[in-house]
């Protein structure tokens, strides 16, 4: 607890002080006071620098004195033998004695009192900026007229802050301009204009004279302009060193004028005005601005239109133009919007074809569709090349945005059939020789695939079973092989309207119009073992002549067994219809004369016992296309015969092409159109 006075005595005083003692006293008087410490008695063993025994006076980190020996007063009217005056309110006294004293020393007696200090004069650093007033225990600062004391109670300044300028034009000057500005002041001026206008400050060089910078280049007095996060300055010196025209790009400007205690000059004067906020004429690639102007300011509106092949993407919506407004902050609205190249996106995939992954899907990019060759070809032309058009669509020169269509190649076996002599009298065949061959398992029969969705067969095959199970792609009809091949599911069976349905089909003698179509539920995927046969053309080129050769195939009866396990085939010549009429029916169910022969029938066979037989019904009689030797077309369908191993009768497909096309067209799916 601070005290105003006190006494300090060495140990055992006035008796001799003991050896090996170290004792300290912490003196503290109230703040605002100094300490007067005086000794009235001093008797301590003398040594050089008081190294043996001593009394030490410390103020803060400073040693004020170190005493030893004997002292007597120089003034007969005063008992004081040594005294110390410190302007601080704390002092430490330390007494030390060593291990031996040659004589008897009595030590010391000392007293301290709190003394007033003159803060205004006693310190190097003057506490007040202007007037200092001392009183016992303290001081206070005061200011000249028109100055006020700052909150720190030490510094005086002029009251030059708080002015807010809102007019679109104005003039501001430092206090007393052109007389010297006040020292030790911070003047803040605020310019606040309507949003959309920027503050433009203009100065003349000669209207500026502020105390110059120090040797380190730091302004002692300074003028600073602050506009948002941008700062201009600090400026100082004789003549304005900054730009004479400052475009702040802001409607709010703070002017800060800071002065120190020394070196007052005449100060400064400036003019300001509000400019409509300019917006930069931005270079927006791939677009045109409307209207085109040299300068755009607050509230100007432009329409930015993208060039062809470019679009503005906002969210998921693409547009070709947008509006932008020059805003109050000097920035364009919608500035994030850009004219980007139109993106046509990942091209749609097509059935039975592919499109290479494009390097780019942007405007001008090119892609190529191809069909899965050699089993499919591009039906609707156009070459398959599409480019990304300005409207965001992939476009072909011929088809426009319509996608190419890959349709099965017909009539081309992967491997040609080679007779290995030995169907009746025929040879072993591979399904790759007859990829159009369809197997019906109930009844055991055949058919011909004519496109992805349709199978052609004989009417008598399907008349008793309108939901036949069919298989494609297998040479063998062992159950194990068929299980691994492609099973076709019928959607509907269409029997030719001219086919006469009988209650007892076994007794049939009229096989006229023995033709039917089976519409499939799902499209067939073509490949080396599955691919359609062509239909005949309607021109006379497709009229068969006697002796024309055709191929038949199937799993019907052979000389060796009632059903073939592996596909058999034979090459047969077309014969005159009378040759078939002349053959005696093997197991007639009626009078021989009752059997009907019509122009809708083809007679073929008669050579080397090669013929179709029970179980081959519905299979194609395949003839080389007269206009394209690489292809086969279905000239006939295995229909009936008087006797296996002689001549057989085949439905003449050419006579039914119109019915086939009409039936398929009327019963196609939208996906096929």
């Amino acid at each position: 607890e601070p005290t105003m006075y006190g006494e300090i005595l060495s140990p055992n005083y006035p008796q001799a002080y003991p050896s090996e003692v170290e004792k300290s006293w912490d003196i503290e008087v109230p703040e605002g006071y100094g300490i007067h410490l005086y000794f009235t008695h001093l008797d301590i063993e003398l040594s050089e620098n008081c190294a043996y025994d001593s009394v030490q006076i410390i103020s803060g980190d400073t040693e004020e004195g170190r005493l030893c020996g004997q002292r007597s007063s120089n003034n007969p009217h005063s008992p004081i033998v040594e005294e110390f005056q410190v302007p601080y309110n704390k002092l430490q006294v330390i007494f030390k004695s060593d291990f031996s004293n040659e004589e008897r020393f009595t030590g010391f007696a000392a007293y301290y009192v709190a003394t007033d200090i003159n803060e205004c004069t006693d310190f190097v650093d003057v506490p007040c900026s202007h007037f200092c007033n001392n009183f016992i225990g303290g001081y206070f600062c005061s200011c000249p007229p028109e100055y006020f004391l700052h909150d720190d109670m030490k510094n005086c300044g002029v009251n030059c802050s708080g002015d807010v300028f809102t007019a679109l034009i104005g003039e501001i000057a430092s206090p007393n301009y052109p007389k010297p500005y006040p020292e030790n002041s911070r003047c803040e001026y605020q310019i606040r204009l309507e949003k959309g206008f920027q503050v433009v400050v203009t100065l003349r060089r000669e209207d500026f004279d502020v105390e110059a910078a120090d040797s380190a280049g730091n302004c002692l007095d300074s003028l600073v302009f602050v506009a948002g996060d941008r700062q201009f300055g600090p400026y100082c010196g004789h003549g304005f060193p900054g730009p004479l025209n400052i475009e702040t790009k802001s409607n709010a400007l703070d002017i800060i004028f800071q002065t120190d205690l020394t070196g007052q000059k005449k100060g400064w004067k400036l003019r300001y005005h509000g400019d409509p906020m300019p917006c930069p004429k931005e270079d927006t690639p791939n677009s045109v601005w409307e209207p085109a102007k040299a300068k755009y300011v607050f509230r100007d509106v432009v329409q930015i239109t993208c060039l062809d092949g470019f679009e503005v993407v906002e969210g998921r919506v693409g547009a070709t133009s947008f509006y932008s407004t020059c805003q109050s902050n000097g920035k364009w609205s919608n500035s994030k919007l850009k004219c980007q190249p139109v993106d046509c996106g990942i091209p749609e995939s097509i059935e039975n074809g592919k499109v290479e992954d494009p390097e780019s899907t942007l405007f001008g990019s090119v892609i190529r569709y191809t069909c899965e060759e050699p089993y499919y070809y591009m039906e609707n032309g156009g070459g398959g090349e599409y480019h990304c058009a300005g409207n965001g669509s992939w476009v072909n020169e011929v088809l426009g945005p319509e996608l190419p269509k890959c349709v099965p190649v017909c009539g081309v076996p992967r491997e040609p059939f080679e007779e290995k002599q030995r169907i009746i009298g025929g040879s072993d065949a591979d399904i790759k020789n007859f990829p159009w061959q369809v197997f019906f398992d109930n009844p055991w029969a055949g058919g011909a695939l004519i496109n992805e969705y349709w199978v052609l067969t004989a009417a008598h095959v399907v008349e008793g079973n309108r939901e036949p199970t069919m298989y494609v792609g297998s040479t063998s009809v062992q159950t194990s092989r068929l299980a691994k091949s492609k099973m076709l599911t019928p959607e509907h069976v269409f029997i030719h309207p001219g086919w006469k349905l009988l209650e007892v089909p076994e007794g049939r003698t009229n096989f006229d119009n023995d033709i039917a179509l089976v519409r499939l539920k799902d499209p067939v995927k073509m490949g080396p073992t599955v691919s359609p046969i062509c239909l005949p053309g309607t021109s006379s080129d497709y009229n068969l002549m006697d002796g024309d050769l055709g191929l038949i195939s199937g799993w019907g009866r052979t000389e060796k067994r009632d059903r073939a396990v592996r596909l058999k085939a034979a090459r047969l010549p077309v014969a005159p219809l009378r040759k078939c009429k002349e053959v005696k029916v093997e197991k007639p169910t009626a009078d021989a004369e009752a059997y009907v022969f019509t122009p809708n029938m083809i007679c073929a066979g008669g050579e080397k016992g090669m013929d179709s037989c029970k179980g081959d019904s519905g299979g194609a009689f395949a003839v080389q296309d007269p206009n394209d030797k690489t292809k086969f077309y279905a000239a006939g369908l295995v229909s009936w015969g008087p006797q296996c191993g002689t001549y057989g009768l085949y439905t003449r497909v050419k006579n039914y092409v119109d019915w086939i096309m009409k039936t398929m067209q009327e019963n196609s799916t939208p996906r096929e159109d």
């Epitope: 109930n442 199970t469 009809v477 062992q478 159950t479 194990s480 092989r481 068929l482 299980a483 099973m487």
Partner: antibody, heavy 125, light 107 residues
Framework: EVQLVESGGGVVRPGGSLRLSCAAS????????MSWVRQAPGKGLEWVSG????????GYADSVKGRFTISRDNAKNSLYLQMNSLRAEDTALYYC??????????????????WGKGTTVTVSS | DIQMTQSPSSLSASVGDRVTITCRAS??????LGWYQQKPGKAPKRLIY???NLQSGVPSRFSGSGSGTEFTLTISSLQPEDFATYYC?????????FGGGTKVEIK
């Protein structure tokens, strides 16, 4: 050459078990169904069991149902007959035979076109 | 189960004779029937399948006929190597059943 060779026969006590095997060669084993047929000494032929090409369908004679199990391992070209709870009346020469199965959903069987030489099973106490 | 009744159970014939063996099914089996020949100490051998189809490699003197419930195996001219036991087999449905057999002996 198409060949079927049976093995695994032998003498076993009533109630005992045996496993017969039939090794096939000279044809694609997994394209055919297979059958077991037995012939008791001096008696006629009796069909025992049959299995289709992939092992998903089996059939048994009433006399062996619940005691015998037919199976196949197509990877090993082998047919098996596991015989449990054997009785004296199971004593016979056991043949394996090949069955041809044609067609899809509606199929046509041609049974037992190729036979093995047989393996003898004797059940006696 | 379908019962197959074969007759006669045995017959004596001479070389060159025409021999007929009959098999009767207890219910209709369409033409799902085969004929087998077995010689003593040998495995059976298929002669006919699907009632009337001659197995490849089998002499043409053997023939089969019939449908439904009545079936016949005919040997048009008996040869010395034809003396054996003949079985019919129905495969219309499980369980498959053989006829009791017909033993053809030399007269």
């Amino acid at each position: 050459e198409v060949q079927l060779v049976e093995s695994g026969g032998g003498v076993v006590r009533p109630g005992g078990s045996l496993r017969l095997s039939c090794a096939a060669s000279g044809f694609t084993f997994d394209d055919y169904g297979m059958s077991w047929v037995r012939q008791a000494p001096g008696k006629g032929l009796e069909w025992v069991s049959g299995i289709n090409w992939e092992g998903g369908s089996t059939g048994y004679a009433d006399s062996v149902k619940g005691r015998f199990t037919i199976s196949r391992d197509n990877a090993k070209n082998s047919l098996y007959l596991q015989m449990n709870s054997l009785r004296a009346e199971d004593t016979a020469l056991y043949y394996c035979a090949r069955d041809e199965q044609l067609g899809g959903i509606k199929y046509y069987y041609y049974y037992m076109d190729v036979w093995g030489k047989g393996t003898t099973v004797t059940v006696s106490s | 189960d379908i019962q197959m009744t074969q007759s006669p159970s045995s017959l004596s014939a001479s070389v060159g004779d025409r021999v007929t063996i009959t098999c009767r099914a207890s219910q209709g089996i369409r033409n799902d029937l085969g004929w087998y020949q077995q010689k003593p100490g040998k495995a059976p051998k298929r002669l006919i399948y699907t009632a009337s189809n001659l197995q490849s490699g089998v002499p043409s003197r053997f023939s089969g006929s019939g449908s439904g419930t009545e079936f016949t195996l005919t040997i048009s001219s008996l040869q010395p190597e034809d003396f054996a036991t003949y079985y019919c087999l129905q495969y219309k449905q499980y369980p498959l059943t053989f006829g009791g057999g017909t033993k053809v002996e030399i007269k």
